[in-house]
């Protein structure tokens, strides 16, 4: 009788993660008596995947009933495949022996490759906000995919970016891979509503790429422009001075009025108006009683935006231009309705 051969007809098998892999194996003879075992890898470090006689292998089922006399089909199914299952699987015939069965003949091996989807890309921006005209870096990461081939693209508001660098790790063979990409983006004043998108395409995604996004509103700081103007006189001895704070983002802003360098009033921007580009405008005003001043008054609107150093704009109020009214007030009126802002 011809000596038993172990036949593994498939050189390779490709399975998607989460699915079941079928590893085929047949023997050409029932002789000698003894079990079949499946291993991943060869040599002393090989991993036992299935033993017909001993052990518990909950993920493995046999394709046919191995207890039947004339059965020579030793194919197995491995359920819930993960990238960690990738490798070469050997169907090995043993003959009965004591205390352990004796390896008799091995199949040529079947390489199991696992197609695993990449994780949803995670895009992260710089830790601190930056102002327009500055270049900021965004990173995109995706993990757990196999095979290694993958395509990553960056977009800003639908326009593809070209200034980025991408690495796929590890460089050598692995059960699964990770991608890491860094893109450089130049900020503009109009970027509050802008989005940066990282798009990952992989064979497992069947033409439907995964996207990760970052809103530039989390990254950008648009400093305000200030304009201080003197409004028409409301009463003979009162002047209305306004500070227009325009085109700023984010909203966090504190304004201080100074009269001749002395703090007159401090307020925080609350009810603001939003521009189409996502930036904000705000206006503060101050009623100045000119009759309380003998000399010219220097009014300063000082704005601290988003924790940055204060910026200011000054306006010189000419007291001589207005006849002095009777009264001995020495300070600007800033009580009652004067403390209200006009929006």
């Amino acid at each position: 009788e011809e000596e038993l051969q172990v036949i593994q007809p498939d050189k390779s098998v490709l399975v998607a993660a989460g699915e079941t892999a079928t590893l085929r194996c047949t023997a050409t003879s029932l002789i000698p008596v003894g079990p079949i075992q499946w291993f991943r890898g060869a040599g002393p470090g090989r991993e036992l995947i299935y033993n017909q006689k001993e052990g518990h292998f909950p993920r493995v089922t046999t394709v046919s009933d191995l207890t039947k006399r004339n059965n020579m089909d030793f194919s197995i199914r491995i359920g819930n495949i993960t990238p960690a299952d990738a490798g070469t699987y050997y169907c090995v015939k043993f003959r009965k022996g004591s205390p352990d069965d004796v390896e008799f003949k091995s199949g040529a091996g079947t390489e199991l490759s696992v197609r695993a989807k990449p994780s949803a890309p995670v895009v992260s921006g710089p830790a601190a906000r930056a102002t327009p005209q500055h270049t900021v870096s965004f990173t995109c990461e995706s993990h757990g995919f196999s095979p290694r081939d993958i395509t990553l693209k960056w977009f800003k508001n639908g326009n593809e970016l070209s200034d980025f660098q991408t690495n796929v790790d590890p460089v050598g063979e692995s059960v699964s891979y990770s991608i890491h990409s860094t893109a450089k983006v130049v900020l503009t004043r109009e970027d509050v509503h802008s989005q940066v998108i990282c798009e990952v395409a992989h064979v497992t995604l069947q033409g439907d790429p995964l996207r990760g996004t970052a809103n530039l509103s989390e990254t950008i700081r648009v400093p305000p422009t200030l304009e201080v103007t003197q409004q028409p006189v409301r009463a003979e001895n009162q002047v209305n001075v306004t500070c227009q704070v325009r085109k700023f983002y984010p909203q966090r802003l504190q304004l201080t009025w100074l009269e001749n360098g002395n703090v007159s009033r401090t307020e925080t921007a609350s009810t603001v108006t939003e521009n189409k580009d996502g930036t904000y405008n705000w206006m503060s005003w101050l009623l100045v009683n000119v009759s309380a001043h003998r000399d010219d008054v220097k009014l300063t609107c000082q704005v601290e935006h988003d924790g940055q150093p204060a910026v200011s704009k000054s306006h010189d109020l000419k007291v001589s231009a207005h006849p002095k009214e009777q009264g001995s007030n020495t300070a600007a009126e800033n009580t009652g309705s004067n403390e209200r802002n006009i929006y």
């Epitope: 008596v33 006689k53 207890t67």
Partner: antibody, heavy 120, light 107 residues
Framework: QVQLVQSGAEVKKPGASVKVSCKAS????????MHWVRQAPGQRLEWMGY????????KYNEKFKGRVTITRDTSASTAYMELSSLRSEDTAVYYC?????????????WGQGTTVTVSS | DIQMTQSPSSLSASVGDRVTITCKAS??????VAWYQQKPGKAPKLLIY???YRYTGVPSRFSGSGSGTDFTFTISSLQPEDIATYYC?????????FGGGTKVEIK
């Protein structure tokens, strides 16, 4: 290491029954088939039947059918052979023996044997 | 049932001699034949299965051959510890059946 340990010797009267036990250790009891083989004095070995502990499947030699019952207790890793309606020619050493499959009749491990004497 | 006819029923040989035992099946059993050694008061011990496969731990002086209906068991160089009765057995189909045995003695 694999061991099959059988119960002690029995003396029975004709017409009675005998139940011999075989406790297995050192391997997964349900993964191998347990056979019973007897050897009467000066006679050849004679296969009586088997039990597959995995599925409780049994098969008996027609010669003993109706008189032999093989059972198992998987929790105790023990197989039993009961022979009824004993006659003097049933005097023999009874062995339990292990095989890999129910279609495999080559026995790699044997119990030490249990002597059953049938005498009035 | 398949009958297994073993011969000789006994033999006497000197230490170092080549000893051959034959077994004939009443019908084709392919290569499903086992050989056992049994010493007095002991259980049989598996030596050869599937006609020619030596069980682990069995000395290489023991060998088996044959297929179909004719089978041979050989001890290439008889040793004092080989004194025993040897049985052939077909493990092709139930009921598994044994030969009558060959008692091997030292001259």
């Amino acid at each position: 290491q694999v061991q099959l340990v059988q119960s002690g010797a029995e003396v029975k009267k004709p017409g009675a029954s005998v139940k011999v036990s075989c406790k297995a250790s050192g391997y997964t009891f349900t993964s191998y088939v347990m056979h019973w083989v007897r050897q009467a004095p000066g006679q050849r070995l004679e296969w009586m039947g088997y039990i597959n502990p995995y599925n409780d499947g049994t098969k008996y030699n027609e010669k003993f059918k109706g008189r032999v019952t093989i059972t198992r207790d998987t929790s105790a890793s023990t197989a039993y052979m009961e022979l009824s309606s004993l006659r003097s020619e049933d005097t023999a050493v009874y062995y339990c023996a292990r095989s890999y499959y129910d279609y495999d009749g080559s026995f790699d491990y044997w119990g030490q044997g249990t002597t059953v004497t049938v005498s009035s | 049932d398949i009958q297994m006819t073993q011969s000789p029923s006994s033999l006497s040989a000197s230490v170092g001699d080549r000893v051959t035992i034959t077994c004939k099946a009443s019908q084709d059993v392919t290569t499903a034949v086992a050989w056992y050694q049994q010493k007095p008061g002991k259980a049989p011990k598996l030596l050869i299965y599937s006609a020619s496969y030596r069980y682990t731990g069995v000395p290489s002086r023991f060998s088996g051959s044959g297929s179909g209906t004719d089978f041979t068991f050989t001890i290439s160089s008889l040793q004092p510890e080989d004194i025993a009765t040897y049985y052939c057995q077909q493990h092709y189909s139930t009921p598994w059946t044994f030969g009558g045995g060959t008692k091997v003695e030292i001259k």
